[in-house]
Amino acid sequence: SIPWNLERITPPRYRADEYQPPDGGSLVEVYLLDTSIQSDHREIEGRVMVTDFENVPEEDGTRFHRQASKCDSHGTHLAGVVSGRDAGVAKGASMRSLRVLNCQGKGTVSGTLIGLEFIRKSQLVQPVGPLVVLLPLAGGYSRVLNAACQRLARAGVVLVTAAGNFRDDACLYSPASAPEVITVGATNAQDQPVTLGTLGTNFGRCVDLFAPGEDIIGASSDCSTCFVSQSGTSQAAAHVAGIAAMMLSAEPELTLAELRQRLIHFSAKDVINEAWFPEDQRVLTPNLVAALPPSTHGAGWQLFCRTVWSAHSGPTRMATAVARCAPDEELLSCSSFSRSGKRRGERMEAQGGKLVCRAHNAFGGEGVYAIARCCLLPQANCSVHTAPPAEASMGTRVHCHQQGHVLTGCSSHWEVEDLGTHKPPVLRPRGQPNQCVGHREASIHASCCHAPGLECKVKEHGIPAPQEQVTVACEEGWTLTGCSALPGTSHVLGAYAVDNTCVVRSRDVSTTGSTSEGAVTAVAICCRSRHLAQASQELQ
Amino acid sequence: QEDEDGDYEELVLALRSEEDGLAEAPEHGTTATFHRCAKDPWRLPGTYVVVLKEETHLSQSERTARRLQAQAARRGYLTKILHVFHGLLPGFLVKMSGDLLELALKLPHVDYIEEDSSVFAQ
């Protein structure tokens, strides 16, 4: 008898007739930038403080009738979803509301900027515990709004935003496109993407995860005890803001990078029917539905990793695409993908003192994506070892030669346009797992890391006959850090990580002869970090 | 630049004409860029966020805003500074004619200018 959305985000161990997970986010303050709200609604009375901040445009239309309950509708519902007594996610969280949307639900980029500045100034004047900022709004792509979000995130604030309700690529909207913001798409009770009239939830690489966003019961501003069902990516974002408040209340020292990784880690995986998304967006859209962690503590010192896709490079011959990790994350591997199969591989390179993953388009190619594997690896010391193209027919190889360094990822990059079209595959010699192997025409890049308690192993899955997709997964307790194809023959479209599985995609089988050339091997590098206690002993 | 410390609200008419040239040369030869919303119905022309370079101080932001007003006034344009940003991004929000964008982009410390646009509840 509890609302479906609360049941969906609750791990089975908490489920009963009631929704009462431990600690309701009481150490966290959630800022809501939205419409005005009805603060005396019984769901939120005493837990939402209405600030004096208001920056809204005038309503459109000369005959617009301002009705208080309609003006408050959107914000009241979202405040209820985040922290409502009876139908809220983080029942203990306190909230502060800023009015940046008018009675028609419309605001401006400038008003939102001034609101974000107000939050930053409040934070400086009176530092409190962890802050979560919920932005249940969207406009067109805005460099300045994204920049402001970046600055606020770097000041330690967690920003959560709606992906947008335009059934479109979320990267075309702000603040959804800001990398530092946690961007949330909406799913329904059947774990399907939400359709809203002729439109629906946004999707794509700028979405971090999905959350319940259809028929969400929450506080209605129609009366102080009323409830109403609303739908949208705002409702989905409110769920994630609530979950974030719960996590931060349990572990107040979590950084944004740690929080994002945990949100991804504890999400339900592969439950969304991807057929709803446009075909070209399916691989880019995370198949994740947010959930609370099974226990507020005990995530411990697991190795958390996520996959970050770059923007598309575009089709020009020398076009490149770059994928970046967040400031607190380590780039442990780099791969690339092209729908046409025409690419010149990828490499890890330093940019502004940090490693990035760069993929290279090839002549006649429609463009490439770079795919970074970004991980939380405290006290890590990582470097890239490169072997230039080899003269020998054995192929190019590179390994981690520094004491205590382990291989976390392999990349290969070549200058020639049609690498390996008529060449047999190069196989890794047995008994040498700590090295990357590739074609003699390619330069090979090994990501080598040293971190307390870090151990890695290589896992391969080869299929002799051609197949459109070959996968290899890391077993329980191990985390996928590297994903690549062996060999880099021309019919391989690329490799990428989906959760803990390495996926190698090849061209349509019908266009490839079933010769030995069709053989594809997916290579996963699986790592784990032994318990922090052991790690600290190693350091001594 | 000597005119940077002037009180432009009081000295609009007294400014020497040659100072115009000083103000219009951007620093370090970098060109500030202009951005606007790709979705036409969401654009709000007439209001602009002028974003200044990262290390710009509040006093410089205020001076740059006053300088824009002064130069606009000499060209017969009214402008209104709606807000001066500091704390997150240095810059200011200005209500002005789009005709002044070229002028504004040449002001010192300017990184980029973005036309205001609408956001919507989702």
Epitope: S1, E18, Q20, D222, C223, F227 | -
Partner: antibody
Framework: QLQLQESGPGLVKPSETLSLTCTVS??????????WGWIRQPPGKGLEWIGS???????YYNPSLKSRVTISVDTSKNQFSLKLSSVTAADTAVYYC??????????????????WGQGTLVTVSS | EIVLTQSPATLSLSPGERATLSCRAS??????LAWYQQKPGQAPRLLIY???NRATGIPARFSGSGSGTDFTLTISSLEPEDFAVYYC????????FGGGTKVEIK
Amino acid sequence: QLQLQESGPGLVKPSETLSLTCTVSGGSVSSSSYYWGWIRQPPGKGLEWIGSAYYSGSTYYNPSLKSRVTISVDTSKNQFSLKLSSVTAADTAVYYCARENSGVVPAAGPNWFDPWGQGTLVTVSS
Amino acid sequence: EIVLTQSPATLSLSPGERATLSCRASQSVSSYLAWYQQKPGQAPRLLIYDASNRATGIPARFSGSGSGTDFTLTISSLEPEDFAVYYCQQRRNWFTFGGGTKVEIK
């Protein structure tokens, strides 16, 4: 069929605390579908809502009585109780307990007081 | 606080007659208004909710209308058991009750 029954002392001295309990039968106070409320009626006068409570512990009270009221739900005994402190003669009334749909589960029915207990008269006198 | 004013205070009618009771709110309560019936020595009973919906088991002779600030309870043909006190209640902003209208036998 759901029934509610109020119980508690019929006489309370001024400045003391009035304590009443409502026992629920034919239903559960642990349901997320309902709030459990108290309403009072001074002799010959109209009705006044005192406050309501939810199984999870959330409560809300009439602002005019808020400083003196505590309502709690005891799921183990399937009952809920009212405590009203610092009573005066003006608190003499028939006290009713009633169920109210929380609105969280829309199918549970209208968001009003229904059913009610039969009421218990509490007199405040020394 | 929203104040509900009921009129008349007393309504003297005979069985079979039509009874019209009024409830006026000090500010709009939209349609968030209910009517209760209370007989001597008994608890109130919900008759009409959300201005015009009959509660379970309530005879069709009872009907409610109105929205905003003005509401009416109509008993189309009074039965002997209908003589009682009737209260309106709003939930637009917390809960308040009207002072009541007593329907007595003429």
